[in-house]
């Protein structure tokens, strides 16, 4: 039975040109995390495999950095980076857990005026 839950940073915002850390945390289960996939809509950003290490998609290698931990750092943000991001945890023996983060990338001037999502 799958008892775990994924905690995420929820809805977040960041300034264009800046960077942001995407973080998920799996709790309430003793299942072993074997792999975490990071996806933007249906596009793979990165994989962190417990045994093989990181795979960063070549399309994003110049502006995606692994970590911290199982998280992912997005750099040189553009408005096009606005959207949904998913962390997909493969675990043993539970199976797959998925978390969702919504990122809005704001023009610097807008961000300075406090138009930000609150983290629930």
């Amino acid at each position: 039975m799958m008892t775990g839950t994924i905690e995420t940073t929820g809805n977040i915002s960041a300034e264009k040109g800046g960077s942001i850390i995407l973080q998920c945390h799996l709790s309430s289960t003793t299942a072993q995390v074997t792999q975490v996939n990071w996806e933007q809509q249906d596009q793979l950003l990165a994989i962190c495999n417990a045994d093989l290490g990181w795979h960063i998609s070549p399309s994003f290698k110049d502006r995606v950095a692994p970590g911290p931990g199982l998280g992912l750092t997005l750099q040189s943000l553009t408005v096009n980076d606005t959207g949904e991001y998913f962390c997909i945890y493969h675990t043993y023996p539970d199976g797959t857990y998925t978390g969702r983060i919504f990122l809005e990338v704001l023009e610097s001037s807008v961000a300075e005026h406090g138009a930000r999502f609150q983290i629930p």
Epitope: T34, Q35, N49, A50, P58, S59, D62
Partner: antibody
Framework: EVQLVQSGAEVKKPGASVKVSCKAS????????MHWVRQAPGQRLEWMGR????????KYNEKFKSRVTITVDKLSSTAYMELSSLRSEDTAVYYC????????????WGQGTTVTVSS | DIVMTQSPDSLAVSLGERATINCRVS??????LAWYQQKPGQSPKLLVY???TLAEGVPDRFSGSGSGTDFTLTISSLQAEDVAVYYC?????????FGPGTKVDIK
């Protein structure tokens, strides 16, 4: 066009080391991880390890961990695999193979380098 | 290590007929399975990754299916140039391991 061109065949004595090179072209070398896989005569393919050419970080098959070293030279877009303490069972064709876009499989392979270990 | 087995060891199929190769894995690898084709004296060539995604430039007579521990590669209409050994490989953990191969010939 993606190309992985490997160094020529080698004949080595037991106990010696061999270093095989793999020159990449047709893509951005540092954006794609590189794997090394070998195939002994009549045997299945055997994965040896992988490297991130950007950071130099590598992961190895535990079976080879004490004997294999995978390195890169970013300036020449070349990957290297060195295997030490050679024995007759290491006689095989050694392949470099580029990691794919979407995971740890390999989408392009070098032509292979035959390494013969014989006294 | 994750153990890969393939069946059959070899098969002979008439031109234009269907060829089916199975790969069984010792533990759940979700859909992290690749198929390669290796012709005599050549390097392996990627056909399928993530169990069912066809690699660039691969003819659509090839298809992959399955998830978990059981996977299949199908050649819907065998052509003369398909004579080769076919290997499955999981791409899920260390070490990456390959099946023993299935040799496909023309009947």
């Amino acid at each position: 066009e993606v190309q992985l061109v490997q160094s020529g065949a080698e004949v080595k004595k037991p106990g010696a080391s061999v270093k095989v090179s793999c020159k990449a072209s047709g893509y951005t070398f540092t954006n794609y991880y590189m794997h090394w896989v070998r195939q002994a005569p009549g045997q299945r393919l055997e994965w040896m390890g992988r490297i991130d050419p950007d950071s130099g970080g590598s992961k190895y098959n535990e079976k080879f961990k004490s004997r294999v070293t995978i390195t890169v030279d970013k300036l020449s877009s070349t990957a290297y695999m060195e295997l030490s303490s050679l024995r007759s069972e290491d006689t095989a064709v050694y392949y470099c193979a580029r990691e794919g876009h979407y995971g740890f499989y390999s989408d392009y392979w070098g032509q292979g380098t035959t390494v013969t270990v014989s006294s | 290590d994750i153990v890969m087995t393939q069946s059959p060891d070899s098969l002979a199929v008439s031109l234009g007929e269907r060829a089916t190769i199975n790969c069984r894995v010792s533990e759940n690898i979700y859909s992290y399975l690749a198929w390669y084709q290796q012709k005599p004296g050549q390097s392996p060539k990627l056909l399928v990754y993530n169990a069912k995604t066809l690699a660039e430039g691969v003819p659509d007579r090839f298809s992959g299916s399955g998830s978990g521990t059981d996977f299949t590669l199908t050649i819907s209409s065998l052509q003369a140039e398909d004579v080769a050994v076919y290997y499955c490989q999981h791409h899920y953990g260390n070490p990456l391991t390959f099946g023993p191969g299935t040799k496909v010939d023309i009947k």
